[in-house]
Interface confidence: medium
């Protein structure tokens, strides 16, 4: 138990969020970070993994409603599986219907997140900013 | 001390954020919430106050860098003081130079926050969405 050394007392009217990596955004007990540097999808994935996180997974419009106000385009963890035509998250789960509007803007097998729950298809080698996400237990 | 009844143990490698009102966004120990309903500036201010918060105050590009990615326009706590021509926050503090680019879009004494640290002057009676903020102690 040596990793745990802070005791925090929380008012009943409010709550703590997390835990998250330092200076990440915490919302509904998920952690998010927006990275400014442009990387291709694979580099972005590696960057998130190095921080014990993964590229953004959109799983709930309700739990992730902060995403509707995100400006610009950012890599998320959604990839196209040519063998069966589906869009899957990094963890292997299938994209749920009606969660994202997939827009066929470019030819590619990776997807950028854009505001209001849109996903833009993009070539995986194209550099873009990216969003990492860590689910708290 | 009766309000405090939760003890939380935090790993040293990560940290909790807050405390914040339930389901608010927590970032660098500030709490933020985006409200969808359109209200005029005064109603927006009252709504934030009723939640023990205030309209958004921009005080640091570094501590509030999540704001650069915010889409659309939202009331913040910045008002024009006609008697001396300055822009002040609700708490009476003067807007620091170089924090916001003030854009004179409309005639008015209130300001909307827009992405990349821009402030749009707007008539205070115009309904808009709004951002509430609560500084954690």
């Amino acid at each position: 138990n040596s990793l745990f050394n802070q005791e925090v007392q929380i008012p009943l009217t409010e709550s703590y969020c997390g835990p998250c990596p330092k200076n990440w955004i915490c919302y509904k007990n998920n952690c998010y970070q927006f990275f400014d540097e442009s990387k291709n999808w694979y580099e972005s994935q590696a960057s998130c993994m190095s921080q014990n996180a993964s590229l953004l997974k959109v799983y709930s419009k309700e739990d992730q409603d902060l995403l509707k106000l995100v400006k610009s385009y950012h890599w998320m963890g959604l990839v196209h599986i040519p063998t069966n035509g589906s869009w899957q998250w990094e963890d292997g789960s299938i994209l749920s219907p009606n969660l994202l509007t997939i827009i066929e803007m470019q030819k590619g097998d990776c997807a950028l997140y854009a505001s209001s729950f849109k996903g833009y298809i993009e070539n995986c080698s194209t550099p873009n900013t990216y969003i990492c996400m860590q689910r708290t237990v | 001390n009766s309000l405090f009844n939760q003890e939380v143990q935090i790993p040293l490698t990560e940290s909790y954020c807050g405390p914040c009102p339930k389901n608010w966004i927590c970032y660098k120990n500030n709490c933020y919430q985006f409200f969808d309903e359109s209200k005029n500036w005064y109603e927006s201010q009252a709504s934030c106050m009723s939640q023990n918060a205030s309209l958004l105050k921009v005080y640091s590009k570094e501590d509030q860098d999540l704001l650069k990615l915010v889409k659309s326009y939202h009331w913040m706590g910045l008002v024009h003081i006609p008697t001396n021509g300055s822009w002040q926050w609700e708490d009476g503090s003067i807007l620091s130079p170089n924090l916001l680019t003030i854009i004179e879009m409309q005639k008015g004494d209130c300001a909307l926050y827009a992405s990349s640290f821009k402030g749009y002057i707007e008539n205070c009676s115009t309904p808009n969405t709004y951002i509430c903020m609560q500084r954690t102690v």
């Epitope: 063998t83 069966n84 009606n98 509007t101 997939i102 066929e104 030819k107 590619g108 | -």
Partner: antibody
Framework: QQLEQSGGGLVKPGGSLELCCIA?????????MTWVRQAPGKGLEWIGC?????????SYASWVNGRFTLSRDIDQSTGCLQLTSLTAADTAMYYC??????????????WGQGTMVTVSS | DIQMTQSPSSLSASVGDRVTITCQAN??????LNWYQQKPGKAPKLLIY???SLQSGVPSRFSGSGSGTDFTLTISSLQPEDFAAYYC?????????FGGGTKVEIK
């Protein structure tokens, strides 16, 4: 890259017909194949689509109501549309189409020449 | 289902004219909209995808604009080969739906 259609013709009300679309010049198994129809003098109407790969995932327009069935044969690079319980309202030119890229399913840049189906007694 | 309303249903124009066709969705589809051209007896041809992206090989006199629910196809200077029917199609979600079409005829 092309789509070659076959199988149209005259059929009696209540009858059945199979339309097929042979793909050439590209890897059929990595693309969606879509079917669209156009009644004489009318607009375009989406019928449904099927993925050419192992899963054969399908999606249909609600009005199809089980009367039409999409299938594909990966080895033959062929997609087929089985039409059943046909009525005069199904009289139309039927097109197969392919998206512009394998990860697309809703934007079509390659079309078959069309095959006419006439339902009449 | 998303409904697409196209207008006008037909128009008469002369070579060199600027022609505008509009398409309206009954709900927000962002920029997930395609435009097709169809000549008599032929299959449709993709002109514009993602509301404003010009398909490879399509002349630059064709342009698309709009986002959300309102979209426009513009032909800046009508050429003889442009007399055809034009259809919009939403690419936001299944089932896919097309507009009713606009027939561009010679005046």
């Amino acid at each position: 890259q092309q789509l070659e259609q076959s199988g149209g013709g005259l059929v009696k009300p209540g009858g059945s017909l199979e339309l097929c679309c042979i793909a050439s010049g590209f890897d059929f198994s990595t693309y969606w194949m879509t079917w669209v129809r156009q009644a004489p003098g009318k607009g375009l109407e989406w019928i449904g689509c099927i993925h050419g790969g192992g899963s054969g995932t399908t999606s249909y327009a609600s009005w199809v109501n089980g009367r039409f069935t999409l299938s594909r044969d990966i080895d033959q690079s062929t997609g087929c549309l089985q039409l059943t319980s046909l009525t005069a309202a199904d009289t139309a030119m039927y097109y197969c189409a392919r998206p512009g890229y394998r990860s697309w399913s809703k934007t079509f840049d390659l079309w078959g020449q069309g095959t006419m189906v006439t339902v009449s007694s | 289902d998303i409904q697409m309303t196209q207008s006008p249903s037909s128009l008469s124009a002369s070579v060199g004219d600027r022609v505008t066709i509009t398409c309206q969705a009954n709900q927000d589809i962002s920029n997930a909209l395609n435009w097709y051209q169809q000549k008599p007896g032929k299959a449709p041809k993709l002109l514009i995808y993602a509301a404003s992206s010009l398909q490879s090989g399509v002349p630059s006199r064709f342009s698309g604009s709009g986002s959300g629910t309102d979209f426009t196809l513009t032909i800046s200077s009508l050429q003889p080969e442009d007399f055809a029917a034009y259809y919009c199609q939403q690419a936001a979600s299944f089932p896919l739906t097309f507009g009713g079409g606009t027939k561009v005829e010679i005046k």
